[in-house]
Interface confidence: medium
């Protein structure tokens, strides 16, 4: 037989299929011009010594054999003793290691047999009520086509799956979208309506994340506020890559999911901006301030779960000894400047309340004063720590207000707040006789006890009604009695107690009279 | 979401001393300052102990001396030692992620004879 032509002869090997899982598959036959033929077929197995023929039986029942040798392609011409414009029946029979091969069959009508492209270019996926819709340009000359596509997990091999008749310009399928895992697809086609005809080859993988991207586990940790009351976020664990199908490894366009950083800053919420949303690799570098930190993760479907750390206020080592004058039309708070043109925020809380419950103000940008002080200063008529109770205060700093990562702690402390002078009067000052020219006073601990670093000492005063003398004597904050010696008896005395801040003295209690008892001998 | 559960309360004779612990649980990124508050019937919420980021700490003069404020770095634990406890000690005690609105419940400290 000439190599030409297809062979009416017996094949030079023994008729018997071996049927094991190697030897050739996806056979594929189609016209390639006018008078010229090529069919196509894959091998799987070890190659090595391995001889292909193309086997083909006419309508008439009579059979032939190409020989290929170890090539898995072979052209021949309407002149090889193939009918090409009858049905024929092709499969490939490979002799390997004394054994033969076979592939499935095709049959077909070589003439009409046009060879098809699988979808090329860019195949656009997008969600459509819970599935997913591939769509792609048809190849030029190629409208009218049967499509499948197969699919598989990391875990799962191919399945199979239809996309039905294509009939225009652009070719779309429906396929399943799985929930938490990526999926490889492959796509082919094949001339609609011209029986027996071949399949394409399977597309370049399209590579599918999962409906929901997955939800990152990260761990965070935040350095402690540096002297410049900034601390930085820092990220422990980097959020664990997807699980891919083995033909998405690699580059996998498609695939991707992106991590960001939205950061809430809680703090002094009259600030013009509260959220900002960075990438997950950029750090940022925080104030002294209590944040909500989310990690967003999304994919080209959307935005998946998010995971919301909460970053508390770092306090100050030490409150803050804040200069505050009282004046008859309003308090001014003093502290150290940062620097030139900067924003403060002034925030403050009753001790003891809902954060939630913080108020604050913003200043305008102000350079620091001779002394090197920044200021803040508000009227009775605000209402600004107006009721006489604790208040802690936070003071922020920054030269660019409108860029939430700027900002950083100036300090922060405790304030009494309203008339502290007089809420802070010391009550239930009472007397008890200690000895022949001693008594002991005690009273009730002073409101302004109940904050932190305010108050910073009581003061007794003790009159003499004869002489007018006076004696003052002061106490630790911590005490709320003392003993007052030297006393005559028979004389007439009155008591007052007072409690004073750093900045203000306080108001005298009620005066309490007493006297010591003269002793009579027997 | 953080969560606070306080426990340790108790009754205890004047003079007597108890210890309370706070565990905080949930995403907390870093070292809270945790604070401890009381509130007795009929009066306002009032700070007793306050323990910063860096472990500082501070008290309201009417517990100085008496209270101790301390912390468990490695989950997130505050205990309040208190000592030489008096009558006017008595309140539901609360632990508070400072400056937040995550507070816990309340453990009760009742001190009479």
């Known amino acids: 037989c000439r190599t030409s032509e297809c062979c009416f002869q017996d094949p030079p090997y023994p008729d018997a299929d071996s049927g094991s899982a190697s030897g050739p598959r996806d056979l594929r036959c189609y016209r390639i011009s006018s008078d010229r033929y090529e069919c196509s077929w894959q091998y799987e197995g070890p190659t090595a010594g391995v001889s292909h023929f193309l086997r083909c039986c006419l309508s008439s029942g009579r059979c032939c054999y190409f020989a290929a040798g170890s090539a898995t392609r072979l052209q021949f011409s309407d002149q090889a003793g193939v009918s090409v414009l009858y049905t024929v029946t092709l499969w490939v029979e490979s002799w390997a290691r004394n054994q033969t091969e076979k592939s499935p069959e095709v049959t077909l009508q070589l003439y009409n047999s046009v060879k098809y492209e699988p979808p090329l270019g860019d195949i656009k996926v997008s969600k459509l009520a819970g599935q997913l819709r591939m769509e792609w340009e048809t190849p030029d000359n190629q409208v009218g086509a049967e499509v499948q596509f197969r699919h598989r997990t990391p875990s799962s091999p191919w399945k199979l799956g239809d996309c039905g008749p294509q009939d225009d310009d652009t070719e779309s399928c429906l396929c399943p979208l799985e929930m938490n895992v990526a999926q490889e697809f492959q796509l082919r086609r094949r001339q609609l309506g011209s029986q027996g005809s071949s399949w394409s080859k399977w597309s370049s993988p399209v590579c599918v994340p999962p409906e929901n991207p997955p939800q990152p586990q990260v761990r965070f940790s935040v350095e402690q506020l540096g002297q410049d009351g900034r601390r930085r976020l820092t990220l422990k664990e980097q959020p664990t890559q997807l699980e891919l199908p083995e033909g998405c490894q690699g580059l996998a366009p498609g695939t991707e999911v992106t991590y960001r950083l939205q950061l809430h800053m809680l703090s002094c919420p009259c600030k013009a901006k509260a959220t900002r949303t960075l990438h997950l690799g950029k750090m940022p570098y925080l104030s002294g301030a209590a944040y909500n930190v989310a990690v967003i993760s999304s994919n080209q479907f959307g935005p998946g779960l998010n995971q919301t750390w909460h970053i508390p206020a770092d306090t100050h080592t030490e409150p803050v000894a804040l200069n505050i004058s009282v004046g008859t039309n309003g308090t001014t708070m003093y502290w150290p400047a940062r620097a030139q043109s900067m924003t403060y925020c002034i925030e403050w809380q009753p001790v003891g309340q809902d954060g939630g419950l913080a108020t604050c103000s913003l200043t305008a940008p102000q350079d620091p004063d001779p002394a090197g002080m920044a200021t803040y200063s508000w009227s009775r008529e605000s209402g600004a720590m107006g009721q006489e109770k604790c208040y802690y205060i936070t003071i922020f700093a920054s030269a660019h207000p409108e860029k939430l990562t700027l900002w950083s702690t100036v300090l922060s402390t405790y304030h009494f707040g309203g008339n502290a002078s007089a809420a802070g009067t010391p009550h239930h000052v009472s007397v008890k006789n200690h000895s022949l020219d001693s008594v002991s006073v005690d009273w009730a601990p002073s409101l302004l006890s109940t904050c932190p670093g305010v108050l910073k000492e009581y003061v007794v005063r003790c009159r003499d009604e004869d002489s007018k003398q006076v004696s003052e004597h002061p106490v630790q904050p911590t005490e709320t009695q003392v003993t007052l010696s030297g006393l005559r008896a028979g004389v007439a005395y009155t008591v007052q107690v007072r409690a004073d801040t750093a900045w203000l003295r306080g108001v005298w209690s009620q005066p309490q009279r007493f006297s010591i008892e003269v002793q009579v001998s027997d | 979401e953080v969560q606070l559960v306080e426990s340790g309360g108790g009754s205890v004779q004047p003079g007597g001393s108890l210890r309370l612990s706070c565990a905080a649980s949930?995403?907390?990124?870093?070292?809270?300052?945790m604070g401890w508050y009381r509130q007795a019937p009929g009066k306002q919420r009032e700070l007793v102990a306050i323990?910063?980021?860096?472990?500082?700490?501070n008290y309201p003069e009417s517990v100085k001396g008496r209270f101790t404020i301390a912390r468990e770095n490695a989950n997130n634990t505050v205990y309040l030692q208190m000592n030489s406890l008096k009558p006017e000690d008595t309140a539901v005690y609360h632990c508070?992620?400072?400056?937040?609105?995550?507070w816990g419940q309340g453990t009760q400290v009742t001190v009479s004879s």
């Open positions: 508070n992620l400072h400056g937040t609105r995550f």
């Open positions: 949930g995403l907390i990124v870093g070292r809270p300052a």
């Open positions: 323990i910063g980021s860096g472990g500082n700490t």
